[in-house]
């Protein structure tokens, strides 16, 4: 058995096992740098167990320390396409609402690469909405093995 | 104490704590893009607690959501050696058997870099075998701090 | 409820949930390649729950398998600044004390990029001190969303 009898009688979410893995749905209109995400078994291997999506942005439902991870690959990309701009293509993950808690959590530039991938531990609170902002003139790949975003509750 | 008394009486695997961290054993013959892995304390800091190796490929023994991570560094590599090919050196992690569940989970190209590293959450089922395919004409480093592959069960 | 009643009566550290996320404090003097870290809520979103800092280096207080992760971004960096050196800028994470357990756990070179990020599972023992050595002539960014280092206890 995986869990003790007492634990098995509780729904998994009550154990604090909030978790989500999302795939890219679409980018925003030109003035909106946010990536819009989707998740659910009908879409493939993405899922939401606890957190929820609000207009394509991930909203946290349980306080705790989370492992946040992301990978973004640029579409039809070569080293020259990412290196030739004065302002390199950059990906930032942050809390975008509530406004009082707005902060950048994770930031990476592509420089001469076409993929960024990273992860970090960070405290998040119920109601925090995470935004992933991609600045630059290249589109992110929508292939589910190239671009994804997820969180995992790891500790109160 | 780390675990409650009830938990301490159960073997760790029964708690669902399946976990593995592998080091590179060797590459396949020329027509086989798969990397072959090995693990165990006698080899250094690699280990398998739950998952198992089948001819160098990692097989899952417990259903659940896993964090899969990988880092691969290319041997005697410079920016020029990875950037000059039409088809860049690429690493893909996927379920390769059973055939009915075959899918690419994680894919990265080296472009002008010599190391890729990423991680993602994905549902895996007992019997899934994960393959790591490296396409290109450069050898992966066998140094244990440069090339490694692991999984961690995080939730049913 | 997040935890069973029995679990709620134990301090979290007794469950083995040791975890830390650190931000860069400063680099060492010229002959010391180590990065010096700091953590705590007063500093922002960094924290130590279990592990401790010893002169800016992270010391483990509980045996187990840990997920170690790091991201380092170089300050005022472009592809040319990282690629033009014969000896590329390199980041290594290792156990630096006790000396008997000294080993490199994770190593990455920047090549033509300005950020490295990776993670791995590794067994660590109480008293292990982790050092992060940055070799090269470029400074690491102290922005908390660009440079960070963390560990998470995942299994005995």
């Amino acid at each position: 058995q995986r869990l003790s009898r007492a634990q098995q009688q509780l729904p998994l979410e009550s154990l604090g096992w909030d978790i989500a893995e999302l795939q890219l749905n679409h980018t925003g209109p030109q003035q909106d740098p946010r990536l819009y995400w989707q998740g659910g078994p009908a879409l493939g291997r993405s899922f939401l167990h606890g957190p929820e999506l609000d207009k394509g942005q991930l909203r946290i439902r349980r306080d705790g320390i989370y492992m946040v991870h992301i990978q973004v690959t640029l579409a039809i990309c070569s080293s020259t396409s990412t290196s030739r701009h004065h302002h390199p293509t950059t990906l930032a993950v942050g809390i975008c609402s509530p406004a009082s808690r707005s902060i950048s959590l994770l930031r990476l530039s592509f420089h001469q690469g076409c993929t960024i991938a990273s992860q970090r531990l960070t405290p998040l609170a119920r109601g925090d909405t995470l935004c992933t902002n991609l600045t630059g003139t290249l589109l992110p790949s929508r292939n589910t093995d190239e671009t994804f975003f997820g969180v995992q509750w790891v500790r109160p | 104490q780390r675990l409650s008394r009830a938990q301490q009486q159960l073997p760790l695997e029964s708690l669902g704590w399946d976990i593995a961290e592998l080091q590179l054993n060797h590459t396949g013959p020329q027509q086989d893009p798969r990397l072959y892995w090995q693990g165990g304390p006698a080899l250094g800091r690699s280990f398998l607690h739950g998952p198992e190796l089948d001819k160098g490929q990692l097989r899952i023994r417990r259903d659940g959501i896993y964090m899969v991570h990988i880092q691969v560094t290319l041997a005697i590599c410079s920016s020029t050696s990875t950037s000059r090919h039409h088809h860049p050196t690429t690493l893909a992690v996927g379920i390769c058997s059973p055939a009915s569940r075959s899918i690419s989970l994680l894919r990265l190209s080296f472009h002008q870099g010599c190391t890729i590293a990423s991680q993602r959450l994905t549902p895996l089922a007992r019997g899934d075998t994960l393959c790591t395919n490296l396409t290109g004409t450069l050898l992966p480093s066998r140094n244990t701090d440069e090339t490694f592959f692991g999984v961690q069960w995080v939730r049913p | 409820q997040r935890l069973s009643r029995a679990q709620q009566q134990l301090p979290l550290e007794s469950l083995g949930w040791d975890i830390a996320e650190l931000q860069l404090n400063h680099t060492g003097p010229q002959q010391d390649p180590r990065l010096y870290w700091q953590g705590g809520p007063a500093l922002g979103r960094s924290f130590l729950h279990g592990p401790e800092l010893d002169k800016g280096q992270l010391r483990i207080r509980r045996d187990g398998i840990y997920m170690v992760h790091i991201q380092v971004t170089l300050a005022i960096c472009s592809s040319t600044s990282t690629s033009r050196h014969h000896h590329p800028t390199t980041l290594a994470v290792g156990i630096c004390s006790p000396a008997s357990r000294s080993i490199s756990l994770l190593r990455l070179s920047f090549h033509q990029g300005c950020t490295i990020a990776s993670q791995r599972l590794t067994p660590l023992a109480r008293g292990d001190t982790l050092c992060t050595n940055l070799t090269g002539t470029l400074l690491p960014s102290r922005n908390t969303d660009e440079t960070f280092f963390g560990v998470q206890w995942v299994r005995p």
Epitope: - | Q30, I76, H86 | -
Partner: antibody, heavy 120, light 111 residues
Framework: EVQLVQSGAEVKKPGSSVKVSCKAS????????MHWVRQAPGQGLEWMGA????????SYNQNFKGRVTLTADKSTSTAYMELSSLRSEDTAVYYC?????????????WGQGTLVTVSS | DIVMTQSPDSLAVSLGERATINCRAS??????????MHWYQQKPGQPPKLLIS???NLESGVPDRFSGSGSGTDFTLTISSLQAEDVAVYYC?????????FGQGTKLEIK
């Protein structure tokens, strides 16, 4: 099976140049480095340089002080080695060679060799 | 440049006996968990033939009486049971960095 077929023997005067060709069978020519190695009579092997036909990128042994020029014609899958300012000590068998798969300088496939004699 | 030094310069061994050729590099040719050392056989009037790559990897079609070993700076080519067709000159070569360099060769003859 990859085959490398080189041009025929040459006799050259000191101070002149020689251009040796190496035609590769198969369609993988642009993807692999082509190396040139020479061997003076009764002597050992000396690496001269390499070209990556896909881009024309070259790497040379500094011992030849700019006397060697490597080129490649993707359309004909042919690599060329030109050696200028010939002297008598350049008398040697010149080989083209390449790795079977990897992008490293060890040599699975060799041409049959081209004897270049430098004599006045 | 890395200098490769073979020993002996020549070697005479009886048929069926073991032949051992050594190669020393002026600095380590090991990197990334591999030894970038290779061995070739050359017979008169022919190009060299690759026998062993990466110190100990026997090439396809090469008899298993040939074996390679070593790491760092010191390497060995061994022929476990010498056959008449093994008479040739043997070369070691590194590919750790540019330029790759060869040993001076070892001439193997039958005693």
């Amino acid at each position: 099976e990859v085959q490398l077929v080189q041009s025929g023997a040459e006799v050259k005067k000191p101070g002149s140049s020689v251009k040796v060709s190496c035609k590769a069978s198969g369609d993988t020519f642009p993807r692999y480095n082509m190396h040139w190695v020479r061997q003076a009579p009764g002597q050992g092997l000396e690496w001269m340089g390499a070209i990556f036909p896909g881009t024309g990128e070259t790497s040379y042994n500094q011992n030849f002080k700019g006397r060697v020029t490597l080129t490649a014609d993707k359309s004909t899958s042919t690599a060329y080695m030109e050696l200028s300012s010939l002297r008598s000590e350049d008398t040697a068998v010149y080989y083209c060679a390449r790795n079977s798969y990897y992008d490293y300088a060890w040599f699975t496939y060799w041409g049959q060799g081209t004897l270049v004699t430098v004599s006045s | 440049d890395i200098v490769m030094t073979q020993s002996p310069d020549s070697l005479a061994v009886s048929l069926g006996e073991r032949a051992t050729i050594n190669c020393r590099a002026s600095k380590s040719v090991s990197s990334s968990g591999y030894s970038f050392m290779h061995w070739y056989q050359q017979k008169p009037g022919q190009p060299p033939k690759l026998l062993i790559s990466l110190a100990d990897n026997l090439e396809s079609g090469v008899p298993d009486r040939f074996s390679g070993s070593g790491s760092g700076t010191d390497f060995t080519l061994t022929i476990s049971s010498l056959q008449a067709e093994d008479v040739a000159v043997y070369y070691c070569q590194h590919s750790r960095e540019f330029p790759p360099t060869f040993g001076q060769g070892t001439k193997l003859e039958i005693k």
